[in-house]
């Protein structure tokens, strides 16, 4: 039985994002309080009450407000989020009559994937190198027009909270791959992108 | 002097349904949620749930949602619970009492003489 | 839901000596607005819940000052100075913090 509904939220790094609490049941708070969930106990963030208004907590003064004023639906915005933002938020709608009654909603931050792809001949060998950096991590496939070709990948976490997956094609005849597509895939969020090279002759 | 007068002792058959009602006086009826509980033979207290008189609007334990409903008619200044599909571990004795709206200090404050609910065929 | 856990089931006291209940919650009844929504109630033989202490510690009118409520957080004592006859019956704590409210067990005082 849902007191609270709430929604999950993702959001592109560096830009706003909202959290909505709507309590149901045609109850209304006297207060609305969104407090950030930590591992010890919560941080209070902004309450808003009719005798009071708007109370943001210094930590988030020019991070946050409360873009929708109201005791029975409450939206908070944060106007530029940081990966500090992400995790989950907890709103607390006081009423004599109930209760603290609560919900939460969590945001996650993403950053769309940076992709670079090419090639470099070395002897017999040719190495072609897809590099994608994201976040959540990205995963990076190849499609190349015959099987049997070798590959090898490194994943490296950046301290930033991205992360990078670089796959490197080995592919031992490299005449025969001469003027050919290689496809790279990099799926992100469930979504498949592919970035092509075709292979000259250095 | 506040009072809640709840109506009398049910014996009704399984799978009936029952209304109980909490008459107020002596206060705001508006003022205050009015809230209902439930007490098995020699058990403890069990809250089902409240009910806002300035807008009808009820919320439920979880354990008697779907079990209880709760109403009002501010006309009159009373609460109702009906309980529907009742079965055996339905038998108990059903109290009402008031909880502020407003107040901090009027949190169960008053309750109802109680209903005996007894259920078998 | 938060737990409220009494502690004893049952308790046996001489009329004239001292008693105490234990409650604890499973959560902080301490509210946003620094208030502590946590009430003791008396049930006697054949009779509704009467409110005897609100908000931890206030007495409410006509509830002899024999009884004490204290307690913080998650803690919280019920104690009669010397019980009396009209003592006996089964007490409960309540809180009413967090949603949905909850009540203990119940400890039975029995008069010796």
């Known amino acids: 039985q849902v007191q609270v509904v709430t929604q999950d939220e993702r959001e592109q790094l560096y830009t706003p994002a909202s959290l909505k609490c709507s309590l149901q049941n045609a109850q209304e708070a006297l207060i609305v309080t969104w407090q950030k969930k930590k591992a010890v106990s919560p941080e209070n963030m902004v309450t808003f009450s009719e005798n009071h208004g708007v109370v943001i907590q210094p930590a988030y003064k020019d991070k946050i407000n409360i873009t929708q004023l109201g005791l029975q639906n409450s939206t908070i915005t944060f106007w530029n989020i940081t990966l500090e933002d992400e995790g989950c938020y907890m709103c607390l709608f006081n009423t004599f009559g109930f209760g603290k009654i609560s919900g939460t909603a969590c945001l996650t931050v993403y950053v769309q994937p940076i992709v670079s792809l090419h090639y470099k001949f070395s002897e017999d060998h040719l190495n072609i190198t897809c590099s994608a950096t994201a976040r959540p991590a990205p995963m990076v496939f190849w499609k190349v027009p015959r099987s049997g070709i070798e590959n090898s990948t490194v994943t490296l976490s950046h301290p930033n909270g991205t992360t990078s997956v670089t796959s490197i094609l080995h592919i031992k005849d490299p005449k025969n791959q001469v003027g050919k597509e290689v496809i790279c895939q990099v799926l992100h969020l469930g979504t498949v992108t592919d970035f092509k090279q075709t292979v000259n002759k250095g | 002097e506040v009072q809640l007068q709840q109506s009398g002792p049910e014996l009704v058959k399984p799978g009936a349904s029952v209304k109980i009602s909490c008459k107020t006086s002596?206060?705001?009826?508006?003022?205050?949620?009015m809230h209902w509980v439930k007490q098995s033979h020699g058990k403890s207290l069990e809250w089902i749930g409240g009910v806002n008189p300035n807008n009808g609007g009820a919320l439920y334990n979880q354990k008697f949602k779907g079990k209880a409903t709760l109403t009002v008619d501010k006309s009159s200044s009373t609460a109702y619970m009906e309980l529907r599909s009742l079965a055996s571990e339905d038998s108990a004795v059903y109290y009402c009492?008031?909880?502020?709206?407003?107040?901090?200090?009027?949190?169960?404050?008053?309750w109802g003489q109680g209903t005996s609910v007894t259920v078998s065929s | 839901d938060v737990v409220m856990t009494q502690t004893p089931l049952t308790l046996s006291v001489t009329i004239g000596q001292p008693a105490s209940i234990s409650c604890k919650s499973s959560q902080s009844l301490l509210d946003i607005d620094e208030k502590t929504y946590l009430n003791w109630f008396l049930q006697r033989p054949g009779q509704s819940p009467k409110r005897l202490i609100y908000?931890?510690?206030k007495l409410d009118s006509g509830v002899p000052d024999r009884f004490t409520g204290s307690g913080s957080g998650t803690d919280f004592t019920l104690k009669i100075s010397r019980v009396e006859a009209e003592d006996l019956g089964v007490y409960y704590c309540?809180?009413?913090?967090?949603?949905?409210?909850?009540f203990g067990g119940g400890t039975k005082l029995e008069i010796k």
């Open positions: 002596g206060y705001t009826f508006t003022e205050y949620t």
């Open positions: 009492a008031r909880r502020s709206n407003y107040r901090y200090d009027d949190a169960m404050d008053y």
């Open positions: 908000l931890v510690s």
């Open positions: 309540w809180q009413g913090t967090h949603f949905p409210q909850t």
